[in-house]
Every structure is written in C-alpha cells, then in structure tokens.
Amino acid sequence: EEELQVIQPDKSVLVAAGETATLRCTATSLIPVGPIQWFRGAGPGRELIYNQKEGHFPRVTTVSDLTKRNNMDFSIRIGNITPADAGTYYCVKFRKGSPDDVEFKSGAGTELSVRAKPSAPVVSGPAARATPQHTVSFTCESHGFSPRDITLKWFKNGNELSDFQTNVDPVGESVSYSIHSTAKVVLTREDVHSQVICEVAHVTLQGDPLRGTANLSETIRVPPTLEVTQQPVRAENQVNVTCQVRKFYPQRLQLTWLENGNVSRTETASTVTENKDGTYNWMSWLLVNVSAHRDDVKLTCQVEHDGQPAVSKSHDLKVSAHPKEQGSNTAAENTGSNERNIY
C-alpha cells in the first residue's frame, strides 16, 4: 500500500471578513491510524487551529464526519473570519503515539487571505479657523482593510484636489492596514458652504467607495467689512447713524459703539440676515440727539468677530451743522433697541 499523502488542493483562499473560510484537505489513505490537526504557520511557533482529538475549537467545524471509518476528508470551516486569521494553514496527519501523537505528514499549506473593508474615512480639519487666501490642511484616516491596495482621492465641492500626501501603514506584511492622507486646501470667501471630501476605494467595496466629509464652515472665518453712515435727519435735533457689518462668518460677533473713544453701548449680533454664500450681514444703528452737543462727535463702530482682535470704523458727526433745538429736551428718544441718545 502506497504511503499516505496529505493533499491541500487550494494554494490560496480569499475570504471576506465576517464570512466563513473553508480549508480543504484530504488524505490518500487511512493508514496509519491517527488524527489530523490543523495549524497556522510552520515550525515551533505554529498555532494550533484544530485538533481532532483534544481541545475545544468553537469557531471550527469539520466538513465531513471524521469519525466515519472510510473518511479521508479532513477539510475544516473557520467561522467569522477577521484579518487576524490571515496566514498559511497546514493540514497535518499524526500517527498515534504516547504520550503525544507523532507528526507523520503535512500538507503543502493553504494561504488564507482576508478581505477586510476599510473603516469609514474620518476627515478632520485644523484646530483653529483660518481666513480666506490661507492654506489649511485636512487629514483623512481609514483603518482595518486588507489587502493593502487602496485608492484615496480628495475633492472640494466635487472638484478633485491634487495637493495631498498619502501613506499606507505598515509598509511590510500585516493582517490589516491603515491609510492616512493630508490635503492642502486654499480657502476662499465663498467657502462657507463648501465641503472637503475624502474618498476611499478598495476591492472589498465593489465599486462603491466610502466617503468622509468635512464642512469648511467648521474651518473658515470670513472677517466682516464695516461701513458707518449717517442717515438723513429724522427730526431737527436727531441723527441716525448706522454701522453695516457685512459678509462675516461665523455668526459670533460683538459690536461696541464708542463716542469720542468712550464706550457707549455693546451688543451681540442676533437677528442677522444670511447671504447666499452662507456669510451673514447685520446692522446696528444709533439715534443721536445732537442738541446737547456743542462740539463735533466722533462715533466709532468697533466689532470683535469670533474672538479676533477688534476692527473698527469711525464717523465724524458735525454738531455745528445741525441747529440747536429750542428747549431743554435731553431725554433719549429710544424708539428701538439700537437707538441711543447722546447727552
């Protein structure tokens, strides 16, 4: 009788993570009597995957009934495969021995490769906001994929970006891999509604790439432009001065009126109007009673936007240009929350 051979017909097997791997093995003879064991790897550090006689292997099932007399099929199934299961599996015939069975013959091995999907890409922007014309960096990370080949692209509002650097780690063989990419984006004033997208394509995704997004609204700061104007006289002794705060983002804004350098009133932007590009406009006004003033008044609109240093715009109010009101009405005519009487 010809000596037993252990046949592993599949040189390699490719399985998706979470699925069941079937590792095939047959023997050409029942002789000698003794069990089959499966190992991952070879040599002294090999890992026992299944022992027909001893131990508990909850993830492993046999394809056929190994207790049947004429069974020569020693194939196994390993359930719930993860990237950590990748490696070369050997079907090894042992012959009975004491105290341990004696290794008799090994199959040639089957390499198990695990296809694992990349995790959803996570895009993160800079820690601090930046203003238009500045270049900011965005990072994209995805983990746990296998095999190593992967494609990553960056887009801004659907337009592919070219200024980025990508690394896949580790460089050598591994059960799974991670990708890290950094893209440079130049901000424009119109970017409040813009999105940066990181797109990852991998064999496991069957042509349906994963995307991670970052809204530039989280990154951009558009500083306001200020315009202070004097409106036509509402009454003989009153002047309406407005401060138009235009095209700012984000909304967080505090406005202070100064009269001749002294704080007159401070308010926070509340009822703003939104522009099509996502920036905001806001207007504050003062109703100035000029009757009490003998000298010209310098009115300053000072704006602190998003915690940045204040910007201001001033307007000189010529008191002499307006006739003094007869009588002594010094009370403010507060017809709106933004009206202010000058004493």
């Epitope: 009788e1 002789i31 000698p32 009597v33 003794g34 069990p35 027909q52 006689k53 001893e54 131990g55 207790t67 049947k68 007399r69 012959r95 009975k96 004491s98």
Partner: antibody, heavy 120, light 107 residues
Amino acid sequence: QVQLVQSGAEVKKPGASVKVSCKASGYTFTSYVMHWVRQAPGQRLEWMGYINPYNDGTKYNEKFKGRVTITRDTSASTAYMELSSLRSEDTAVYYCARSYYDYDGSFDYWGQGTTVTVSS
Amino acid sequence: DIQMTQSPSSLSASVGDRVTITCKASQDVTTAVAWYQQKPGKVPKLLIYSASYRYTGVPSRFSGSGSGTDFTLTISSLQPEDVATYYCQQHYSTPWTFGGGTKVEIK
C-alpha cells in the same frame, strides 16, 4: 499521563452478573473509544465490544450479544462493562482498552485488568 | 469472523538472534494488523499498528511488515527483556480478533 484504572477482582456464582468499571484520566474521555477485551486462562485475547463516549454508540461481539452491556458516565470519565448469565468459562481477566476511533481496533492504552472468577 | 493464525506458538532463541513471528489472516485485512507484547502477569502493550508503524517508545529492533493476509513481526536482535508472549490482531473489521500468541523464550 493517560491512565485507565479498573475496579477490583470479583468472584461470582454461575447465573449472576458482574459489572466492571474503568476510570479514564489524562485525556479527553469523549474523544476516544473504550473497548473491553478479555483473556481466559491460557486462551487468546478476545474482544467483547466498545462504546464511543462521544455519542454513546456501542458495538458488541456477536458471541456476547445479549449478555454484555457497555455503558459510560461522561461526567465521571468512566466506562462500565456488565456481563450477565455468568458461566464458568467466563472466568477471565477483563481489560478495558482505548482506541482512537470506533473503526480503529488497535489499543494503545490498557487498564490493569480485573479478574472475574465464576465458581459455584 | 476473521481468523488470525499465528506461528510458531512458541520459540526459544539466543540473545542477539533475529526472531520472526508470522501471522496469517483468513481474509484480506489490507494493512490493518497490530502486534502486542504481553509479559507474564502484565497487560498487553502495543508494539506495531497498521502492519508496520512502530508505536512511540517501542525499540527500533521491533518491526512489522506485510499486507493482505500475511504479516510478520521481526525482532532484529533478541534481548533478555523481550521474553514475553506476542499477539497479532486484525483491526480491519469487527469483531477485532487476535492470534493465539507466540511465546518467546531465551535459550
């Protein structure tokens, strides 16, 4: 290490029954098959039957069918052989012996033997 | 049942001699034959299984051969501790059956 320890010697009258135990240790009891083999004085070894503790499957030598019953208690890792309707020619040393499979009849470990004497 | 006929039933040989014991099966048992050694007052001990595979711990002077119906156990150089009765057994089909034994003694 693997050990099969059998119960002590028995003296029985013809027509009686005897039950011999075999306690296994040092291996997974349910992974191997337990056989019973006897050896009458000056006679060849004689296989009586087996039990597969994994599935409680049994097989008996036709010669003893109806008289021999092999059972097991997996929680105690113990196999039992009961022989009924004893006659003088049943006087023998009874061994339990282990094999790898129910289709494998080569026995790598043996118990120390239990002498059963049938005498009126 | 398959009959196993062993010969000789006994033999006496000198230390260092080559000893051969034969066993004949009444029908083809492929290579499903085992050999056991039983010393006086002791339990049988497995020497060879599947006709030619030496069990672990068994000295290399013991070897088995044969297939089909004719099988041989050879002790290449008899030692004093080899004094025992040797049994062949077929493990091809139930009921497993044993030969009558060969008693080996030292001259």
